[in-house]
């Protein structure tokens, strides 16, 4: 069984998101993204910024889905 990471905030998640950022990250700061493992207790989209920070976001937020679509298209 996959154990959840000890990262308890929206920043620097190693495996799972426990909380989500409350701020919309400017699109130009985002370099990449990945989805957290389905075994995590909560779903999460992790955006990686150009400065190398990883930020947990809520997949149900429209801006998150818009960014994902934009990155898939480009």
């Amino acid at each position: 069984t996959k154990t959840e990471s000890s990262s308890r905030g929206p920043y620097h998640p190693s495996e799972c998101c426990f909380t989500y950022t409350t701020y919309k990250i400017p699109r130009q700061r985002i370099m990449d993204y990945y989805e957290t493992n389905s075994q995590c207790s909560k779903p999460g989209i992790v955006f990686i910024t150009k400065r190398g920070h990883s930020v947990c976001t809520n997949p149900s937020d429209k801006w998150v889905q818009d960014y994902i679509k934009d990155m898939k298209e480009n």
Partner: antibody
């Protein structure tokens, strides 16, 4: 006119598998998300899961081990499959659609009438 | 997980009066709160989102307010048609609904 409608529920036995279909009219699933929510008799609303406008499904923590949400964009339908039913799954099941107009896809302004699912031996 | 605790049912008000329904979250939800109205045998109807913004087509006598962990739905100039169950929903964290508050119009 935009609307969603759930398929007929009915009577199920414990350990059965439930399959419900949400048929969408007046909009495309390619630009809408579908949420599944249920309501036990006399109780509050309970979120089950949702499928995004790009087709990714997400689930409530309690539901993810036995629920699957899929969609068919050609037929404009979304399907909820829930396995290992128990009496506690007796509820009215709703599908609800949203295009993110309210900043979050969990906020739904288009709801079906709901369909009653009864689990009993 | 967030727990939403609503005003106990029933809440009654005379026609033309004011009704207040409260929703308390167990942790801060940053105004990510919606209110729904549900009548017997019908699906929920979205009234308020982002704690205070009126959904499309909802009369202005419905007002949402609050922040942090405390949120309120106020109905001014109550009409008979407002008799229903009102539920709050948090969408900051895990998409949890409150248990609902029944409003009775006398």
């Amino acid at each position: 006119c935009q609307s969603v409608k759930e398929s007929e529920g009915g009577l199920f036995k414990p350990a059965d598998t439930l399959t419900l279909t949400c048929t969408v009219s007046g909009f495309s699933l390619s630009s809408f998300a579908i949420n599944w929510v249920r309501q036990a008799p006399g109780e509050g609303l309970e979120y089950i899961g949702w499928i995004s406008d790009v087709g990714t499904a997400y689930y409530a923590s309690w539901a993810k081990s036995r629920s699957t949400i899929t969609r068919n964009t050609d037929e404009n339908t979304a399907t909820l499959k829930m396995t290992s039913l128990t009496a506690a799954d007796t509820a009215t099941y709703f599908c609800a659609g949203g295009d993110g107009s309210y900043s979050n896809y969990w906020v739904s302004d288009i709801w079906g009438q709901g369909t009653l699912v009864t689990v009993s031996s | 997980a967030v727990v939403l605790t609503q005003t106990a049912s029933p809440v009654s008000a005379p026609v033309g009066g004011t009704v207040t329904v409260k929703c308390q979250a167990s942790q801060t939800i940053n105004n990510r709160l919606a209110w729904y109205q549900q009548k017997q045998g019908q699906p929920p109807k979205l009234l308020i989102y982002e704690a205070s913004k009126l959904a499309s087509g909802v009369p202005s006598r419905f007002k949402g307010s609050g922040s942090g962990t405390e949120y309120t739905l106020t109905i001014r100039g109550v009409e008979c048609a407002d008799a229903a169950t009102y539920s709050c929903q948090e969408y900051a964290d895990e998409n949890i609904f409150g248990g609902g508050t029944e409003v009775v119009v006398k």
